[in-house]
Interface confidence: medium
């Protein structure tokens, strides 16, 4: 089942997805698509990276984190109700049938009439269940964190802080994460 993330109309939504490159600069292709992860690739692709760079993107969709270090979390700019739905983060690990697929559900709420007085930092406190599986080819051991139910009602104000703050580490520990190598 998909894990739910929330944002308000007009804000930026954040959908976490991470992997740890086997070596610095040894990147794995990743795609983001609107809709559940299909059999192959990502349906309705909104952003894609290759072994070097972001090679395809559409307006309003971008990677705010350092994708060269495996932070391929998706930011959706200025969301509307139409942005609600399931998004697929697919980490395309080399090897036979080795891809890792994460379905993330984005719920967009109408904007509040009055602005919230304080920033919302109420992340679900549960630690993810960790699962170690034996991979194929270059992916020796893969550690997958299950996704928490994260409530981000004021994403736009947090977006810049996420990169350097302890919050970013919390997200990395509890988001869609796969370690390669």
């Amino acid at each position: 089942s998909e894990v739910e993330y929330r944002a308000e109309v007009g804000q930026n939504a954040y959908l976490p997805c991470f992997y740890t490159p086997a070596a610095p600069g040894n990147l794995v292709p990743v795609c983001w698509g609107k809709g559940a992860c299909p059999v192959f690739e990502c349906g309705n692709v909104v952003l894609r990276t290759d072994e070097r760079d972001v090679n395809y993107w559409t307006s309003r969709y971008w990677l705010n984190g350092d994708f060269r270090k495996g932070d391929v979390s998706l930011t959706i700019e200025n969301v509307t109700l139409a942005d609600s739905g399931i998004y697929c983060c697919r980490i395309q690990i080399p090897g036979i049938m080795n891809d890792e697929k994460f379905n993330l559900k984005l719920v967009i709420k109408p904007a509040k009439v009055t602005p919230a007085p304080t920033r919302q930092r109420d992340f679900t406190a549960a630690f993810p269940r960790m699962l170690t599986t034996r991979g194929h080819g270059p992916a020796e051991t893969q550690t997958l964190g299950s996704l928490p139910d994260i409530n981000l009602t004021q994403i736009s104000t947090l977006a810049n802080e996420l990169r350097d703050s302890r919050l970013a580490n919390d997200l990395r520990d509890s988001g869609a994460t796969i370690r390669i190598g």
Partner: antibody, heavy 119, light 110 residues
Amino acid sequence: QVQLVQSGGGLVQPGGSLRLSCAASGFTFSSYAMSWVRQAPGKGLEWVSAISGSGGSTYYADSVKGRFTISRDNSKNTLLLQMNSLRVEDTAVYYCARDFSGWGGFDIWGQGTMVTVSS
Amino acid sequence: NFMLTQPPSASGTPGQRVTISCSGSSSNIGSNTVNWYQQLPGTAPKLLIYSNNQRPSGVPARFSGSKSGTSASLAISGLQSEQEADYYCAAWDDSLNNYVFGTGTKVTVL
């Protein structure tokens, strides 16, 4: 112009081998899964095999499993189908197709190439 | 090989609406999206509908798709002679790990 151009069909005896090729142009080849679909004379469409954009994942119809091998060379924008131990029932027009949706939404097709297996 | 079930033929007069059914199971249509293809005589198939009800650019609005449970259907409204063709439904099957086509329906304009 987005297109797929096929080559490599022909006449072969039962038990023989053939290799089909599909050259892609006009799009980022490595970003798409690709499939082979065949159609026997006067019959319907039959999916044969599929391969992910990176080449890491492959799938086969039971009727060709162990005999056919799908592969791709992303540096040359080429999709391949190596067909071994061919049988009379493999006689068909073979199409390569681009899967733009990941769910088998084949939006671009090759022109088709005839493979005839006969003694 | 397993195939989705379609009626072998369907027909209508010009301007009429024709509907083609496609029956499957929980492991294919019930779990995954359905695509529809049109194949004119002597040509490669053409994608008409993807993801149950989406039309690729260039496909006229007279073609529409729907899905309910383990069945899907394709409707052609305002039937024209150029729509005489074979129509195939298709879906991924999770049990077989195969992409399965329908048996095909030949549409005739009377």
